[in-house]
């Protein structure tokens, strides 16, 4: 669906297999691992990307303090179960029947349990805080230039409308990008903030998911912005449920 017609590739996801077997000989692309058809005009969901990855060969000038309920993805990679729309299933289990509940970005939000564990609904991550530290530069970046450049980047590269970039904070060398998106705010065709954050994270790590597009070249008024570390915090509409022993 809406893949590049000429050479039948998926511009937004290199972890696909494409062939001209769609309606009227149109190029159609399927995600590795799941075999699900993907829309190559937009970002592929994080769940399908993780699945593909596992199947592949191996304004205030103050910074935001993440809330006590903010989650960091400490578990890393796993082979997720995705629903027919490509979203994470609320309950994830591994091959040894250890199960846990995840949020809409696939990050664990409960203690691990067994097959009896119930996850009633997929809880939406409505606020993502991307915390970056940039390499030393001659001087600080201009805050409004940095803000404009990041909004442009998220729109053009990740197709995320600027309305979902709630704020860009800057205290040299720390940059914080706040993404906010409630379920009700998403209109037809709007990219999910979780997917945009994941593509951005992979770009920053030099592991671009885009087909044949150069890596991320971030510049603010011509000055390269080189990131040396990234931390991403996820805030859910319903706080996570962990036992006290995890917190000690």
């Amino acid at each position: 669906h809406t893949a590049a017609q000429d050479n039948c590739t998926c511009p937004t996801n290199k972890m696909t297999v494409c062939s001209p077997d769609g309606p009227g000989g149109r190029c159609q692309c399927r995600a590795l691992g799941s075999g699900m058809a993907v829309d190559c005009s937009t970002l592929t969901s994080k769940c399908l990307l993780l699945k593909a990855r596992m199947s592949a060969p191996k304004n205030a000038r103050t910074l935001v303090r993440p809330s006590e309920h903010a989650l960091v993805d400490n578990d890393g990679l796993y082979d997720p179960d995705c629903d027919p729309e490509g979203r994470f299933k609320a309950r994830q289990c591994n091959q040894t029947s250890v199960c846990w509940c995840v949020n809409s970005v696939g990050v664990r939000r409960t203690d691990k349990g067994d097959l009896s564990l119930r996850c009633d609904e997929l809880v939406r991550t409505h606020h993502i805080l991307i915390d970056l530290r940039h390499r030393p530069t001659a001087g600080a970046f201009n805050h409004s230039d940095l803000d404009a450049e990041l909004r442009r980047l998220f729109r053009e590269r990740y197709r995320l409308h600027p309305k979902f970039v709630a704020a860009v904070h800057y205290e040299q060398p720390t940059i914080q990008i706040e993404l906010r998106q409630n379920t009700s705010q998403k209109a037809a065709g709007d990219v999910d903030i979780g997917d945009a954050a994941y593509y951005f994270e992979r770009d920053i790590k030099g592991e671009s998911l885009f087909q044949g597009r150069g890596g991320l070249d971030l510049r603010v008024r011509g000055e390269p912005l080189q990131v040396e570390r990234t931390l991403i915090y996820y805030l859910d509409e319903i706080p996570p449920k962990f036992s006290m022993k995890r917190l000690t």
Partner: antibody
């Protein structure tokens, strides 16, 4: 079927304001962007602004420098475009159009509202 | 703002002809290019979105291609109802979204 029905033609004096309505039916009003586009007589199309009906978020073409305001009433599935400080060059047909968040394509359009600015 | 330039601004053709209209963007817009048809006194109608995807109900004689800055709309075999004005529009970057100036397709 998707329908966007706009209010009738208006004649206004320079300096006045005009408010055009656009009533949507045949789809979930809050699930799509709504855009406003105008077309001066014999001219091309000019994008004016957009709104997400779910939360009322708007963005505008800076060309209109605060003269345009887009609002919505979700209870009646109606979007509104108000243009103030009218001048003769604002004489145009004003269209509302349903938009897609990714392609930013306008897949359904209202029939248009002719606004004539004349002293 | 991104400028969209269409060529030609007008052209004459006959029923059955193959017609091509081009649209050039002032900067790379990837594939986020849409085409509309407008008849006198009527609202525009979406023909093609994302460079080459046909909007529902649009005849298959219409096709689009291109990428980056150069795009084309092709009508493989002109029908009487195709005589109209055609506009391209980019939806790539931050607002404002911009249109080409239009190409008027007339009967020869």
């Amino acid at each position: 079927q998707v329908q966007l029905v706009q209010s009738g033609a208006e004649v206004k004096k320079p300096g006045a304001s005009v408010k055009v309505s656009c009533k949507a039916s045949g789809y979930t009003f809050t699930s799509y962007w709504m855009h406003w586009v105008r077309q001066a007589p014999g001219q091309g199309l000019e994008w004016m602004g957009e709104i997400t009906p779910s939360d009322g978020y708007t963005s505008y073409n800076q060309k209109f420098k605060g003269r345009v305001t887009i609002t919505r009433d979700t209870s009646t599935s109606t979007a509104y475009m108000e243009l103030s400080s009218l001048r003769s060059e604002d004489t145009a047909v004003y269209y509302c159009a349903r938009g897609h968040g990714n392609y930013v394509s306008f897949d359904y359009w209202g029939q248009g509202t002719l606004v004539t600015v004349s002293s | 703002d991104i400028q969209m330039t269409q060529s030609p601004s007008s052209l004459s053709a006959s029923v059955g002809d193959r017609v091509t209209i081009t649209c050039r963007a002032s900067q790379d817009i990837s594939n986020y290019l849409n085409w509309y048809q407008q008849k006198p006194g009527k609202a525009p109608k979406l023909l093609i979105y994302y460079t080459s995807s046909l909007h529902s109900g649009v005849p298959s004689r219409f096709s689009g291609s291109g990428s980056g800055t150069d795009f084309t709309l092709t009508i493989s075999s002109l029908q009487p109802e195709d005589f109209a004005t055609y506009f391209c529009q980019q939806g790539y970057t931050l607002p404002p979204y911009t249109f080409g100036q239009g190409t008027k397709l007339e009967i020869k």
